[in-house]
């Protein structure tokens, strides 16, 4: 697991404890909360990051209209159960034995139930729509420059392959970034769009997960792009199952 050898830290995850106790005295880093060894050459899974966070001290409109199955993470933080690979377990429960099913990004996709609730499989989130509003600028950003800069950001900072950034829409002051990655497209070693979206969300909130790296300094042709609101929609390969009561 690649970690910075000189001072034994994890460049891609500051919510880790690192020590030179790996093979041959190599630096090895474990996620806070779970103690799972993480690969510091890539992004840490959102499940392990959430667990670590819980353990830490506390005209022609071009914009996409999310469909009726789009999920928004309204439940906020919780202490998740992760599998040995760091993925969310399909069923999550709290200390009071209230359980619910989640998708691959850990967002609830069913009504809450009790311990008898069954979640047969972890349903993949294959389409993520990141909806941003930027702070005032002297003028609108050039769409193609904005598109190129955001694609570069996801490629270089989050190591997400460009083929998974499906589109960048812009209608001042709203920017939408569409990430698409279905099960068959994601190869071994590919960063998951859910993890990339979570790192991006934390970056724009000024809560970077990267070790020792400065905050996100997004610029389009030299002009700063400062995000003041973020809303993320998650679309699953199988639509969520909520009762009609929730939908009204």
């Amino acid at each position: 697991h690649t970690a910075a050898q000189d001072n034994c830290t994890c460049p891609t995850n500051k919510m880790t404890v690192c020590s030179p106790d790996g093979p041959g005295g190599r630096c090895q880093c474990r996620a806070l909360g779970s103690g799972v060894a993480v690969d510091c050459s890539t992004l840490t899974s959102k499940c392990l990051l959430l667990k670590a966070r819980m353990s830490a001290p506390k005209n022609a409109r071009t914009l996409v209209r999310p469909n009726e199955h789009a999920l928004v993470d309204n439940d906020g933080l919780y202490d998740p159960d992760c599998d040995p690979e760091g993925r969310f377990k399909a069923r999550q429960c709290n200390q009071t034995s209230v359980c619910w099913c989640v998708n691959s990004v850990g967002v609830r996709r069913t009504d809450k139930g009790d311990l008898s609730l069954r979640c047969d499989e972890l349903v993949r989130t294959h389409h993520i729509l990141i909806d941003l509003r930027h702070r005032p600028t002297a003028g609108a950003f050039n769409h193609s420059d904005l598109d190129a800069e955001l694609r570069r950001l996801f490629r270089e900072r989050y190591r997400l392959h460009p083929k998974f950034v499906a589109a960048v829409h812009y209608e001042q002051p709203t920017i939408q970034i569409e990430l698409r990655q279905n099960t068959s497209q994601k190869a071994a070693g590919d960063v998951d769009i859910g993890d990339a979206a979570y790192y991006f969300e934390r970056d724009v909130k000024g809560e970077s997960l990267f070790q020792g790296r400065g905050g996100l300094d997004l610029r389009v042709r030299g002009e700063p792009l400062q995000v003041e609101r973020t809303l993320i929609y998650y679309l699953d390969e199988i639509p969520p199952k909520f009762s009609m009561k929730r939908l009204t």
């Epitope: 600028t137 002297a138 003028g139 002009e223």
Partner: antibody, heavy 123, light 109 residues
Framework: AVTLDESGGGLQTPGGALSLVCKGS????????MGWVRQAPGKGLEYVAA???????GYGAAVKGRATISKDTGQSTVRLQLNNLRAEDTATYYC?????????????????WGHGTEVIVSS | ALALTQPSSVSANPGETVEITCSGG????????YGWYQQKAPGSAPVTVI????KRPSNIPSRFSGSTSGSTNTLTITGVQADDEAVYYC?????????FGAGTTLTVL
């Protein structure tokens, strides 16, 4: 601590030119918009000019066409050049720092001020 | 050109709560942005008490707060002190230029 030090004020002649310099310290100069605000004797605050971290500029109506704002990131300085001086340019000129890098025109974002430099335009 | 509207003067006894309103700023796609600047004497440097509607610089006491409702921003001083006596200017923007209100004189009785 953030400090902004202005220089270049003093007695100026009508029709002449003025160059004010503000040196910033205690913050990452390149990351923030900077600007100039002035106050004529007995009057309120007036936006003069500003420059964003990406070097886009904005000017107040009273100085548009006569003023040029520029910056030297390496020296952490912002400069205001004001030509064709008039008696109504007499004021205390304050250097101001934005809390953001973005558009220079949003005085709502000013989070720090210099002590000011007095300019008197008189023959 | 837009003009910011704020009261010319307000007064309060020590310990009371004071509210100063500012309206007329430019609309940026449904959002309005304001800042508040305290000047204790003419020619003395202004001090930012609130910027970007609600943000308070670290050196400003917590009794100063800002809030926005629609196109109006309100500076609230909770438990006003004698030292708060000053002129308070609000600032916003009008398309490509910054604008300031005429100032509100706060007198602490």
């Amino acid at each position: 601590a953030v400090t902004l030090d202005e220089s270049g004020g003093g007695l100026q002649t009508p029709g002449g030119a003025l160059s004010l310099v503000c040196k910033g310290s205690g913050f990452t100069f390149s990351s923030y918009a900077m600007g100039w605000v002035r106050q004529a004797p007995g009057k309120g605050l007036e936006y003069v000019a500003a420059i964003s971290s990406g070097s886009s500029t904005g000017y107040g109506a009273a100085v548009k066409g006569r003023a040029t704002i520029s910056k030297d990131t390496g020296q952490s300085t912002v400069r205001l050049q004001l030509n064709n001086l008039r008696a109504e340019d007499t004021a205390t000129y304050y250097c101001a720092k934005s809390g953001y890098g973005g558009s220079a025109s949003y005085v709502s974002d000013i989070d720090a001020w210099g002590h000011g430099t007095e300019v008197i335009v008189s023959s | 050109a837009l003009a910011l509207t704020q009261p010319s003067s307000v007064s309060a006894n020590p310990g009371e709560t004071v509210e100063i309103t500012c309206s007329g700023g430019g609309d940026y796609y449904g959002t309005y942005y304001y800042g508040w600047y305290q000047q204790k004497a003419p020619g003395s440097a202004p001090v930012t008490v609130i910027y970007d509607n609600t943000k308070r610089p670290s050196n400003i006491p917590s009794r100063f707060s800002g809030s926005t409702s629609g196109s109006t921003n309100t500076l609230t001083i909770t438990g006003v002190q004698a030292d708060d006596e000053a002129v308070y200017y609000c600032g916003s923007y009008d398309s490509s230029a910054g604008i300031f209100g005429a100032g509100t004189t706060l007198t602490v009785l």
